[in-house]
C-alpha cells in the first residue's frame, strides 16, 4: 500500500461559554484535517479520536466513527469538534479568560488527533500533535493556519 497522508490544518473555530458559579470555561473547538489517499483504491476513514491538552492536562476528548470513504488519488477535508472544559485546579484561568481589560485571551492548547483508516480489511493509524492558540475570551472563527503556535515545543513534521 502507498501512503495515506494526514495533515492537521488548524483550528477552524472556538465557541466559548462560562459557568460563573463554578468558575468554569467551556470551549467547543472545531479543527480541520486534510486526509490524502495516495493509493489506487478507496480507503475508509473509520474513526478519528482527538484530545486537547492545556498545561499537560487533558481538558477534552472526542471520537467520530464511520466518517467517510476517500477515493484513490483523492483528498478530503474533515472537520471535527472537541468539547473542552477548563475547571477545578485550572479555574484560575477563568479570571484571565473573562478579563475585560484585554482584547485577546489566547491560551496555548495541544491538539492530538489519531486517524484510523481501513482498506482490504487492513487497519492503519496515523497520529498528529500540534500546539495552537485559542482565544478563551470570545467566540472566534479562524483563517486556516492562523491559530498555529510556533515555538521550540512544536513537533517537527
Amino acid at each position: 500500500p502507498r501512503s495515506i497522508d494526514v495533515k492537521y490544518i488548524g483550528v477552524k473555530s472556538a465557541y466559548v461559554s462560562y459557568d460563573v458559579q463554578k468558575r468554569t470555561i467551556y470551549l467547543n473547538i472545531t479543527n480541520t484535517l486534510n486526509i490524502t489517499n495516495n493509493n489506487y483504491y478507496s480507503v475508509e476513514v473509520e474513526n478519528i479520536t482527538a484530545q486537547v491538552q492545556f498545561s499537560k492536562t487533558v481538558i477534552g476528548k472526542a471520537r467520530l466513527n464511520n466518517i467517510t470513504i476517500i477515493g484513490p488519488l483523492d483528498m478530503k477535508q474533515i472537520d471535527y469538534t472537541v468539547p473542552t472544559v477548563i475547571a477545578e485546579e485550572m479555574s484560575y484561568m477563568y479570571d484571565f479568560c473573562t478579563l475585560i481589560s484585554i482584547k485577546v485571551h489566547n491560551i496555548v492548547l495541544m491538539m492530538q488527533v489519531t486517524v484510523t483508516t481501513t482498506y482490504f480489511g487492513h487497519s492503519e493509524q496515523i497520529s498528529q500533535e500540534r500546539y495552537q492558540y485559542v482565544d478563551c475570551g470570545r467566540n472566534t472563527t479562524y483563517q486556516l493556519g492562523q491559530s498555529e503556535y510556533l515555538n521550540v515545543l512544536q513537533p517537527q513534521q
Epitope: 489506487y40 478507496s42 480507503v43
Partner: antibody, heavy 122, light 107 residues
Framework: QVQLQQSGAELVRPGTSVKVSCKAS????????IEWVKQRPGQGLEWIGV????????DYNEKFKGKATLTADKSSSTAYMQLSSLTSEDSAVYFC???????????????WGQGTSVTVSS | DIQMTQSPSSLSASLGERVSLTCRAS??????LNWLQQEPDGTIKRLIY???SLDSGVPKRFSGSRSGSDYSLTISSLESEDFVDYYC?????????FGGGTKLEIK
C-alpha cells in the same frame, strides 16, 4: 456496454506536443480510474500513469514525469494525455484502460481503448 | 521497480495442444497479477485478474496459477484465435510493470 474510444492517429513534428483523448461510455466515468500505457513498434507495454477523473488526482511513472500530463473532463466523460517536447522515442501506440476500484477490491485494466498511434517525424 | 520476466518470448505450438506461459516477479506481488491478450490489430483484452480469476466471456480453456514468484497462464487446448501475443501485468506496486510478452505461433 463499456467502451473506451480513443482519438485517431497523429503525425507530429519533433519538439511539438500532442493530446490523445479517450472517451468513456457505458459506465459511470468518475467511479473508475483511467490508466495510460505506451507500446513502441514491435515492443512490449510500458505504464505511463493513472488519473482519477473524479478528483483529478494523478500518479505517474517517474520515467514519464515532465513528458506526459493526464487530465480528465467529467462533463464529456473524456480522459486526455498530453505528450510534450516530442522526439522519435515518443513514436508509439498509446492505450487508455479502465481501472475499477473500491475499498475491498482492486483489479485494474479490465477494459482497454483501441490505441492511438503517434508518429513523430520531420 | 518490480521486474516481470516473461518466458518464453515466442512459442510454436499446434492446434489442440496444451501450453503454459510464465512470468517471474522480482519481488513479492501476492496475487496482484493480470494476463492480457493482444491481437494483431492491437486490440488488448484482459483474460485473467488476481492471478487466477477468469474475466467474463473468456473461454474456460484459459487458466491462471501461481507457484511462489512464478505465475502461469495455461491454455488447455489451443484454438486458432489463440495464436496472438500475451502479456502479464503486476499491479502490486507503482509503477505497474509488464512482462516482455510471449508471441504464440502456429506450428
Amino acid at each position: 456496454q463499456v467502451q473506451l474510444q480513443q482519438s485517431g492517429a497523429e503525425l507530429v513534428r519533433p519538439g511539438t506536443s500532442v493530446k490523445v483523448s479517450c472517451k468513456a461510455s457505458g459506465y459511470a466515468f468518475t467511479n473508475y480510474l483511467i490508466e495510460w500505457v505506451k507500446q513502441r513498434p514491435g515492443q512490449g507495454l510500458e505504464w505511463i500513469g493513472v488519473i482519477n477523473p473524479g478528483s483529478g488526482g494523478t500518479d505517474y511513472n517517474e520515467k514519464f514525469k515532465g513528458k506526459a500530463t493526464l487530465t480528465a473532463d467529467k462533463s464529456s466523460s473524456t480522459a486526455y494525455m498530453q505528450l510534450s517536447s516530442l522526439t522519435s522515442e515518443d513514436s508509439a501506440v498509446y492505450f487508455c484502460a479502465r481501472d475499477p476500484y473500491s475499498k475491498y477490491v482492486h483489479y485494474p485494466m479490465d477494459y482497454w481503448g483501441q490505441g492511438t498511434s503517434v508518429t513523430v517525424s520531420s | 521497480d518490480i521486474q516481470m520476466t516473461q518466458s518464453p518470448s515466442s512459442l510454436s505450438a499446434s492446434l489442440g495442444e496444451r501450453v503454459s506461459l510464465t512470468c517471474r516477479a522480482s519481488q513479492d506481488i501476492g496475487s496482484s497479477l493480470n494476463w492480457l491478450q493482444q491481437e494483431p490489430d492491437g486490440t488488448i483484452k484482459r483474460l485473467i485478474y488476481a492471478t487466477s480469476s477468469l474475466d467474463s466471456g473468456v473461454p474456460k480453456r484459459f487458466s491462471g496459477s501461481r507457484s511462489g514468484s512464478d505465475y502461469s497462464l495455461t491454455i488447455s487446448s489451443l484454438e486458432s484465435e489463440d495464436f496472438v501475443d500475451y502479456y502479464c501485468l503486476q499491479y502490486a506496486s507503482s509503477p505497474r510493470t509488464f512482462g516482455g510478452g510471449t508471441k504464440l505461433e502456429i506450428k
